[in-house]
């Protein structure tokens, strides 16, 4: 969490951003909040990116002002206009790409004063893993697949019964570059599994951590998966 304060003659206002991550090929949100003003027409929101000459986005007098917008962001950005009055200056970014990563500044002017805060935006790819029993294998084998990750993640297997066990000797992980030549498909195979046990396939990079669980019994197979973004620090 980054909290910034305004400077100069006018009073300062508190602006708060949260470091976040964008999944390439999806829309992303860059979070920013500020002390609200009672008049929308008095609020100016400017988003800037380090190393970029033009503005990322500008909103003032209750509407978008995009004449100074950098070409890199043309047609891709939006603030939540109906939420600006309550202090939400968050930016929506369409079709996030690797090149969108960097340091952004959320700069706010209201009748109360000015303030700004920086935001570190990471970009990559992350997806939910799916764990299945591989019936084609000669021994009981589990196959964990996740369609797109970047940067290359680590894959670790764990088991409920053998807690703390190291499965690196009985697993094999491969990374296959996807057609767009950026993200990769992750496939990890775990050998010699036993029934009546729950296994977890954990995939992690510096952006996200995802886990796929599978419980195999003689009568049924239960699956569960979840994903969490890492590094969501507020400023």
């Amino acid at each position: 969490l980054i909290i910034g304060f305004g400077i100069s003659g006018r009073h300062s206002i508190t602006v708060t951003t949260v470091a976040s991550a964008g999944n390439i090929g999806e829309d992303g949100i860059l979070s920013c909040t500020f002390e609200p003003d009672i008049k929308l027409s008095d609020i100016v929101i400017q988003w800037l990116k380090e190393g970029v000459l033009g503005l990322v986005h500008e909103f003032k007098e209750g509407k978008d002002e995009l004449s100074e917008q950098d070409e890199m962001f043309r047609g891709r950005t939006a603030v939540f206009a109906d939420q600006v009055i309550v202090g939400n200056a968050s930016l929506r970014l369409k079709n996030v790409q690797l090149t969108d990563a960097g340091t952004y500044k959320c700069y706010i002017i209201t009748s109360k004063g000015k303030g700004n805060a920086n935001l570190e935006y990471k970009t990559g790819a992350f997806s939910m893993p799916e764990v299945n029993v591989d019936y084609n294998a000669s021994s009981e084998t589990l196959r964990c697949e996740a369609p797109r990750w970047f940067p290359q993640p680590t894959v670790v297997w764990a088991s409920q019964v053998d807690q703390g066990a190291n499965f690196s000797e009985v697993s094999n992980t491969s990374f296959e570059l996807n057609s767009e030549n950026v993200t990769m498909k992750v496939v990890s195979v775990l050998y010699n599994v036993t029934i009546n046990n729950t296994y977890s396939c954990m995939i992690e990079n510096d952006i996200a951590k995802a886990t796929g669980d599978i419980k195999v019994t003689e009568s049924e197979i239960k699956r569960r998966s979840h994903l969490q973004l890492l590094n969501s620090k507020a400023s």
Epitope: D64, L66, R76
Partner: antibody, heavy 116, light 109 residues
């Protein structure tokens, strides 16, 4: 040359299924938001489905649960699987690329007629 | 759900005249996510304007877009014979993800 070519349209009975294809050339489908948009005879444009660069999909309420958008990255091709077709699905179906700022590349369209 | 309402439904003008087409949204739309398209009979639509005011590649400068919030305008400064067609505005980003206006037919007077 950047191009989209649709195929797979035709006459189908109500309740039937059809799969539309859209072959792309000159750009990589999986890097863009790819859409299906339809136009009923004498009517306006209606958005049908999107597949994001990530592979996630979304569809209009009118086709949810019946139509499925997908892509084959190795063939650089977009698909629309249409099930439980109704008379009101009769339209010209276009695939279109949204290159961040608008649907800048469209196919020529393929006609789907649902009639008994 | 955002509804885009275009007016007029039909606009009858002569070549050389100025055309002003309106698109009104039922709630605020980001300027970045507002586009205009032209469609001629038997053809696919063509992107004219994106980001409310930026001309797409190859679009003549007689076409211009303006507006913000809920009111957007497409202006054709001096009509050429090939400009007579149907024009659609379109927004991105709300539910449904993409919405088109019902269209304005620009016909020769």
């Amino acid at each position: 040359e950047v191009q989209l070519v649709e195929s797979g349209g035709g006459l189908i009975q109500p309740g039937g299924s059809l799969r539309l294809s859209c072959a792309a050339s000159g750009f990589i489908v999986s890097r863009n938001y790819m859409n299906w948009v339809r136009q009923a005879p004498g009517k306006g444009l209606e958005w049908v489905s999107v597949i994001y660069g990530s592979g996630r999909t979304d569809s209009a309420d009118s086709v949810k649960g019946r139509f499925t958008i997908s892509r084959d990255n190795s063939k650089n091709t977009l698909y629309l699987q249409m099930n439980s077709l109704r008379a009101e699905d009769t339209a010209v179906y276009y695939c279109a690329r949204d290159a961040d700022y608008g649907m800048d590349v469209w196919g020529q369209g393929t006609t789907v007629t649902v009639s008994s | 759900e955002i509804v885009l309402t275009q007016s007029p439904g039909t606009l009858s003008l002569s070549p050389g005249e100025r055309a002003t087409l309106s698109c009104r949204a039922s709630q605020s739309v980001s300027s970045s996510y507002l586009a205009w398209y032209q469609q001629k009979p038997g053809q696919a639509p063509r992107l004219l304007i994106y980001g409310a005011s930026s001309r797409a590649t190859g679009i003549p400068d007689r076409f211009s877009g303006s507006g913000s919030g809920t009111d957007f305008t497409l202006t054709i400064s001096r009509l050429e014979p090939e400009d007579f067609a149907v024009y659609y505005c379109q927004q991105y980003g709300s539910s449904p993800l993409y919405t088109f206006g019902q269209g304005t037919k620009l016909e020769i007077k």
